[in-house]
Amino acid sequence: VLEVYYTSLRCRCVQESSVFIPRRFIDRIQILPRGNGCPRKEIIVWKKNKSIVCVDPQAEWIQRMMEVLRKRSSSTLPVPVFKRKIP
């Protein structure tokens, strides 16, 4: 569910939302760290209705959710916490 990608692309998110999305409607969360042409961290959420939204990394709900997912991933080894995609 939680993925970190390192890409050579510039920023992917034109607009960010802080609107709450419950975990039950989230399919996948992709984290794009700062760097490689983008000066900010980006969080992309794939929803279960196939739509995609960029979420403000400062939104409290996404920070809480990522912490829960990290804990959950680390307690269910051998599933990796992060998937790395090397360009």
Partner: antibody
Framework: EVQLVESGGGLVQPGGSLRLSCAAS????????MSWVRQAPGKGLEWVAT????????YYPDNVKGRFTISRDNAKNSLYLQMNSLRAEDTAVYYC????????????????WGQGTLVTVSS | DIQMTQSPSSLSASVGDRVTITCKAS??????IAWYQQKPGKAPKLLIY???TLQPGVPSRFSGSGSGTDFTFTISSLQPEDIATYYC????????FGGGTKLEIK
């Protein structure tokens, strides 16, 4: 006091269409997601659809996807369910329910429910 | 899709008895389970959410426990007004209800 009142149920032939409505009061309607849940006669509960507080996102289980459409009018405090290509197995009492608080961080499920409206699909 | 297996499907108990209903999820749902009470001809009423959080106004004789895939709903001392059908609901991944437990008085 939170109140949800469904209407629009009735008898419809297989293949037909019906539009259900739910009038909400007693809370800030535009701050909450809303859902429809159904219950076939003598059977259990089954989730049908959910719409986000602003109406931009809708979610459905596979068995109604493409046939049912959930929508809302926040100015009228109203929720709707458009049901097309109805089948005998869609016969049920349809409940509207208040869902998660859109401005919150905590995840809670459907908390308040209406009394339901009966939809009968039969020839 | 997540399946919720609720048991028993029906049970008979006496006033004052401790009553336990279980729900088993087909995969880990963390603590995202709720319990509803439905009386004949009425709408479901939320009793408990997030496994053990009591909805305001719900008597303290109702409680919930569990995590992961196994969950329990308990009525510590059955009252006549508790006669109803009880449903669990997982809301970790979309929504799935359990099949229900019809509770009757002996």
């Amino acid at each position: 006091e939170v109140q949800l009142v469904e209407s629009g149920g009735g008898l419809v032939q297989p293949g037909g269409s019906l539009r259900l409505s739910c009038a909400a009061s007693g809370f800030t309607f535009s701050s909450y997601a809303m859902s429809w849940v159904r219950q076939a006669p003598g059977k259990g509960l089954e989730w049908v659809a959910t719409i986000s507080e602003g109406g931009s996102d809708a979610y459905y289980p596979d068995n109604v996807k493409g046939r049912f459409t959930i929508s809302r009018d926040n100015a009228k405090n109203s929720l709707y369910l458009q049901m097309n290509s109805l089948r005998a197995e869609d016969t049920a009492v349809y409940y509207c329910a208040r869902d998660y608080y859109g401005s919150g961080y905590e995840e809670s499920p459907m908390d308040y429910w209406g009394q339901g409206t009966l939809v009968t699909v039969s020839s | 899709d997540i399946q919720m297996t609720q048991s028993p499907s029906s049970l008979s108990a006496s006033v004052g008895d401790r009553v336990t209903i279980t729900c088993k999820a087909s995969q880990d749902i963390n603590k995202y389970i709720a319990w509803y009470q439905q009386k004949p001809g009425k709408a479901p009423k939320l009793l408990i959410y997030y496994t053990s959080t009591l909805q305001p106004g719900v008597p303290s004789r109702f409680s919930g426990s569990g995590s992961g895939t196994d969950f329990t709903f308990t009525i510590s001392s059955l009252q006549p007004e508790d006669i109803a059908t009880y449903y669990c609901l997982q809301y970790d991944n979309l929504y799935t209800f359990g099949g229900g437990t019809k509770l009757e008085i002996k």
